[in-house]
């Protein structure tokens, strides 16, 4: 089955520093997202070979890419305290597959000793609950039908 290998599991960095997140797959995907998990998951980037990457405005000018969509390294620069969170790679394939997540802890330099990563992967509670296998349910579900657009929006 298709899988996404993601590294590192966790990283602690001071404000202003950079972090690399690598997403690797066995190929056969349409493109790949890096998403920040939370009550409302948020796309950070979408990368597809041969297409200009799309980046969330919060990170524009702070993200570099290297490699290809099958083996992509995303570098996030000039990290801020508000960038702390769990980031997961999501491959667009016939069955949605997700990486295990990277917990990024951005700290004030003087307080680095208080917040350190363990060797364990991010806590399961920070990620969508996986069923068997590597395919996960949609972490951003639409619980209700959208309202029909105003009549003026109709063709």
């Amino acid at each position: 089955a298709q899988e996404v290998q993601q590294s590192p599991h966790c990283t602690t960095v001071p404000v202003g520093a950079s972090v690399n997140i690598t997403c690797s797959t066995s190929g056969g995907l349409r493109g790949i997202y890096l998403r920040q998990l939370g009550p409302q998951p948020q796309d950070i980037i979408y990368y597809e070979d041969g297409v200009v990457p799309t980046t969330d405005r919060r990170f524009r000018g702070r993200i570099d890419f290297s490699g290809s969509q099958d083996n992509l390294t995303i570098t996030m620069h000039r990290l801020q305290l508000s960038d702390t969170g769990t980031y997961t790679c999501q491959a667009i394939t016939e069955v949605n597959v997700y990486g295990s997540g990277t917990l990024v802890l951005v700290t004030e330099e003087q307080s680095q000793g208080w917040h350190r990563c363990s060797d364990a992967p991010p806590r399961a509670s920070a990620l969508p609950a996986p069923p068997t296998g590597s395919a996960l349910p949609d972490p951003q579900t639409a619980s209700a039908l959208p309202d029909p657009p105003a009549a003026s929006a109709l063709p």
Partner: nanobody
């Protein structure tokens, strides 16, 4: 440019089946929730079914529950509507609609297709 092209409509007898397709191009399909709407002559356009951007959630208008199934293929950039046990009251023009939800890089963007006619009649 952005396009949503519906196909698969036609004339079918009551109790029959049709499968509608909507092929998307010109935008990042996986960033958008996809919906099917329909409009019968002299009536307002109504929402039939919606599927979330990664396919994890789908919802249906009450009158089609158990008969219609929405699905999507994010590799082929296509959304489908499988319609079974069709009734005369399902007769309408069926439209494809794309809407980028909160959390999407394209939040708020939305696009319509031109529609495909479905006629259920004996």
């Amino acid at each position: 440019q952005v396009q949503l092209v519906e196909s698969g409509g036609g004339l079918v007898q009551p109790g029959g089946s049709l499968r509608l397709s909507c092929a998307a191009s010109g935008f990042t399909f996986s960033g958008f929730d996809m919906s099917w709407y329909r409009q019968a002559p002299g009536k307002e356009r109504e929402l039939v079914a919606t599927i979330s951007r990664f396919g994890g959630s789908s919802n249906y208008e009450d009158s089609v529950k158990g008969r219609f199934t929405i699905s999507r293929d994010n590799v082929k950039d296509t959304v489908y509507l499988q319609m079974n046990s069709l009734k005369p009251e399902d007769t309408a023009v069926y439209y494809c609609y794309a809407l980028a939800p909160a959390g999407s890089l394209w939040h708020g963007d939305n696009y319509w297709g031109q529609g495909t006619q479905v006629t259920v009649s004996s």
